[in-house]
Interface confidence: medium
């Protein structure tokens, strides 16, 4: 069966300066390929986190994604700013040249509240 990307929260609210977790789990690790988080959709979407060796300031993975059986690709965004508001999508790709997007979560909207 086709892999599903599950983002159970429709939205989260976080105060500026605090941290928030965006939950994402997969039903399978197959087909082989990376998982990436984006803010927004379409051409203008912004890469927020990739579960690779890249470094993303203020964004960390919640679980150990290097473990073979891990299906949790949740991320934590620290020191949230008003500019972090938007809808975040957890996206599964199939490895290739280039990688092909095969499934996206339903999106989680982040609301940033003034402190």
């Amino acid at each position: 069966t086709e892999v599903k990307v599950i983002q159970p929260e429709k939205s989260v609210s976080v105060a500026a300066g605090d941290s928030t977790v965006l939950n994402c789990t997969l039903t399978s690790l197959l087909p082989v390929g990376p998982i990436r988080w984006y803010r927004g959709v379409g051409q203008s979407r912004q890469l927020i986190y990739s579960f690779t060796t890249e470094h993303f300031p203020r964004v960390t993975n919640v679980s150990d994604a290097t473990k073979r059986s891990n299906l949790d690709f949740s991320i934590r965004i620290s020191n949230v700013t008003p500019e972090d508001a938007g809808t975040y999508y957890c996206v599964k790709f199939q490895r290739g040249s280039p990688d092909t997007e095969i499934q996206s979560g339903g999106g989680t909207e982040v609301y940033v509240l003034a402190k």
Epitope: K4, I6, P8, E9, K10, S11, T27, G105, G106
Partner: antibody
Framework: DVQLVESGGGVVRPGESLRLSCAAS????????MNWVRQAPGEGLEWVSL????????YYADSVKGRFTISRDNSKNTLYLQMNSLRAEDTAVYYC????????????WGLGTLVTVSS | ETVLTQSPGTLTLSPGERATLTCRAS??????LAWYQEKPGQAPRLLIY???SRATGIPDRFSGSGSGTEFTLTISSLQSEDFAVYYC??????????FGGGTKVEIK
């Protein structure tokens, strides 16, 4: 207080159409995703369809896909379900249900409207 | 699609007794599970969300527990108004949203 009032149910023949309405009050209608859930006589609850607050995102149960259309008019605080090509198995009480703003469970429900499909 | 199985189908008890209703999921839904009460001629009512959090205005005799695939709704001491049908619903997976088949709690 949140109020959801369904209307438009009735008795129709197989193949005919019906449009259900749900008038909402007591909350900011456009900010909430809305659903239709049905219950056939003597059966359990079955989710039918979902529409996001803006109306941009829509889902249907496989059993109604291609026959039912969900829509909303945020200026009138009203949710609709257009039901075409009705079948005997669509006979049920149809509930309008307001989703929680963070998760897909239902905070508030209407009393329902009965749709009977019979020849 | 996540299938929810409720047991027993019917529970026959006396007022004052403890009722234990079970909901099993075909795959993990973590704690993304809600319970509803339905009475004839009334709108369904949200009782529990997040597997164990009581909704606003729900008496503390109602409690929920469990995570993953096994969930329980407990009514500690049945009152006359608690005799009804109870449904679980998972909201972990994106639509289709699924309900259990229901458990009817009836008076002995």
């Amino acid at each position: 207080d949140v109020q959801l009032v369904e209307s438009g149910g009735g008795v129709v023949r197989p193949g005919e159409s019906l449009r259900l309405s749900c008038a909402a009050s007591g909350f900011t209608f456009s900010s909430y995703d809305m659903n239709w859930v049905r219950q056939a006589p003597g059966e359990g609850l079955e989710w039918v369809s979902l529409i996001s607050g803006s109306g941009e995102i829509i889902y249907y149960a496989d059993s109604v896909k291609g026959r039912f259309t969900i829509s909303r008019d945020n200026s009138k605080n009203t949710l609709y379900l257009q039901m075409n090509s009705l079948r005997a198995e669509d006979t049920a009480v149809y509930y309008c249900a307001k989703e929680n703003n963070r998760y897909r469970f239902f905070d508030d429900w209407g009393l329902g409207t009965l749709v009977t499909v019979s020849s | 699609e996540t299938v929810l199985t409720q047991s027993p189908g019917t529970l026959t008890l006396s007022p004052g007794e403890r009722a234990t209703l079970t909901c099993r999921a075909s795959q993990s839904v973590y704690t993304y599970l809600a319970w509803y009460q339905e009475k004839p001629g009334q709108a369904p009512r949200l009782l529990i969300y997040g597997a164990s959090s009581r909704a606003t205005g729900i008496p503390d005799r109602f409690s929920g527990s469990g995570s993953g695939t096994e969930f329980t709704l407990t009514i500690s001491s049945l009152q006359s108004e608690d005799f009804a049908v109870y449904y679980c619903q998972q909201y972990y997976d994106r639509p289709p949203l699924t309900f259990g088949g229901g458990t009817k709690v009836e008076i002995k």
